[in-house]
């Protein structure tokens, strides 16, 4: 059965999925899709990485963590009730029929009438939208949003802070993690 994750309407949802690269920079193709994992890849793909970069994404879906270190957890921005359902994280380990696949259930709850104070910082404030583009040279990373001067070190630090928070650890403990090599 699927592991269940919850978010409120208007919030960002976090669906954890991790792997440990065999060597730094030795990335594995990963896809995220809406719907249970089919036989191959992901159904209704919302985001995909290859051996180098994020090579496909759709609006509102992105990777906040350091996918180059195997954190391929999905963030869905500003969720609505329609975002409820099963999501597939598939880690396409090279070789013959080596895939690891994880079905995660996202439950969206109606927003509370009076918002309660949150114990951790807002995902959007902590992480401006990352846009990774493919090119002929090295991967080019741009940040979109209110923090134009943020750099990769800061992003990595923020990612570590998030992962060190109790909520993120809880999610990680019950999420999808595999080790390669």
């Amino acid at each position: 059965s699927e592991v269940e994750y919850r978010a409120e309407v208007g919030q960002n949802a976090y669906l954890p999925c991790f792997y440990t690269p065999a060597a730094p920079g030795n990335l594995v193709p990963v896809c995220w899709g809406k719907g249970a994992c089919p036989v191959f890849e992901c159904g209704n793909v919302v985001l995909r990485t290859d051996e180098r970069d994020v090579n496909y994404w759709t609006s509102r879906y992105w990777l906040n963590g350091d996918f180059r270190k195997g954190d391929v957890s999905l963030t869905i921005e500003n969720v609505t009730l329609a975002d409820s359902g099963i999501y597939c994280c598939r880690i396409q380990i090279p070789g013959i029929m080596n895939d690891e696949k994880f079905n995660l259930k996202l439950v969206i709850k109606p927003a509370k009438v009076t918002p309660a104070p949150t114990r951790q910082r807002d995902f959007t404030a902590a992480f401006p939208r990352m846009l990774t583009t493919r090119g002929h040279g090295p991967a080019e990373t741009q940040t979109l949003g209110s923090l134009p001067d943020i750099n990769l070190t800061q992003i990595s630090t923020l990612a570590n802070e998030l992962r060190d928070s109790r909520l993120a650890n809880d999610l990680r403990d019950s999420g999808a993690t595999i080790r390669i090599g």
């Epitope: 089919p38 036989v39 191959f40 159904g43 396409q92 090279p94 070789g95 895939d99």
Partner: antibody, heavy 116, light 108 residues
Framework: EVQLLESGGGLVQPGGSLRLSCAAS????????MHWVRQAPGKGLEWVSA????????YYADSVKGRFTISRDNSKNTLYLQMNSLRAEDTAVYYC?????????WGQGTLVTVSS | EIVLTQSPGTLSLSPGERATLSCRAS???????LAWYQQKPGQAPRLLIY???SRATGIPDRFSGSGSGTDFTLTISRLEPEDFAVYYC?????????FGQGTKVEIK
């Protein structure tokens, strides 16, 4: 226009080998998963093998695992199926097909006959 | 593996009639991951439907798919002469990919 053209079929003795090729055109070959599906004479369709975009991940039906090897050369827009230790029951028309889970374009097929 | 059983084996109908083809799975097909293909003699299969009900590019709207779980249906609302062929269902919810044995739609 998407085109898939298989070649390499023929008559081979049991235990022999064949290498099938599928030349693709009309689409960005490296951007799609590819498959081999076969059809024995007068019978239904049987999925044989699949390969991911870059070729790093491969998948096989139990009936051919360990005997067949799928590969691709994205620089040549070509899909391959190396078939070893062939058996009479491998006799079929072999189709290459484009797609991930459903197959939206198919070649016309190449006939492989395994007989002594 | 999921076994797909198609019925009837042969359907004898006249042009203009409605054809209803059934595909039953031995276990539930997740997320309605089911496709339908048409194959004419000497030709390659042609994708008609994916996701149980989505028509593939260029497929006339007289073809429609429905169903979920273990029971799926392909309906041809009004048979045209070019529709007489063999039809296969295929599931992609559980490894390996499997096809049904086919239903032949022949002219009555």
């Amino acid at each position: 226009e998407v085109q898939l053209l298989e070649s390499g079929g023929g008559l081979v003795q049991p235990g022999g080998s064949l290498r099938l090729s599928c030349a693709a055109s009309g689409f960005t070959f490296s951007g799609y998963w590819m498959h081999w599906v076969r059809q024995a004479p007068g019978k239904g369709l049987e999925w044989v093998s699949a390969i991911s975009y870059s070729g790093s991940s491969t998948y096989y039906a139990d009936s051919v695992k360990g005997r067949f090897t799928i590969s691709r050369d994205n620089s040549k827009n070509t899909l391959y199926l190396q078939m070893n230790s062939l058996r009479a029951e491998d006799t079929a028309v072999y189709y290459c097909a484009k797609g991930t889970n459903w197959l939206d374009y198919w070649g016309q097929g190449t006939l492989v006959t395994v007989s002594s | 593996e999921i076994v797909l059983t198609q019925s009837p084996g042969t359907l004898s109908l006249s042009p203009g009639e409605r054809a209803t083809l059934s595909c039953r799975a031995s276990q539930s097909v997740s997320s309605s991951y089911l496709a339908w293909y048409q194959q004419k003699p000497g030709q390659a299969p042609r994708l008609l439907i994916y996701g149980a009900s989505s028509r593939a590019t260029g497929i006339p709207d007289r073809f429609s798919g429905s169903g979920s779980g273990t029971d799926f249906t392909l309906t041809i609302s009004r048979l045209e002469p070019e529709d007489f062929a063999v039809y296969y269902c295929q599931q992609y919810g559980s490894s390996p990919l499997t096809f049904g044995q086919g239903t032949k739609v022949e002219i009555k």
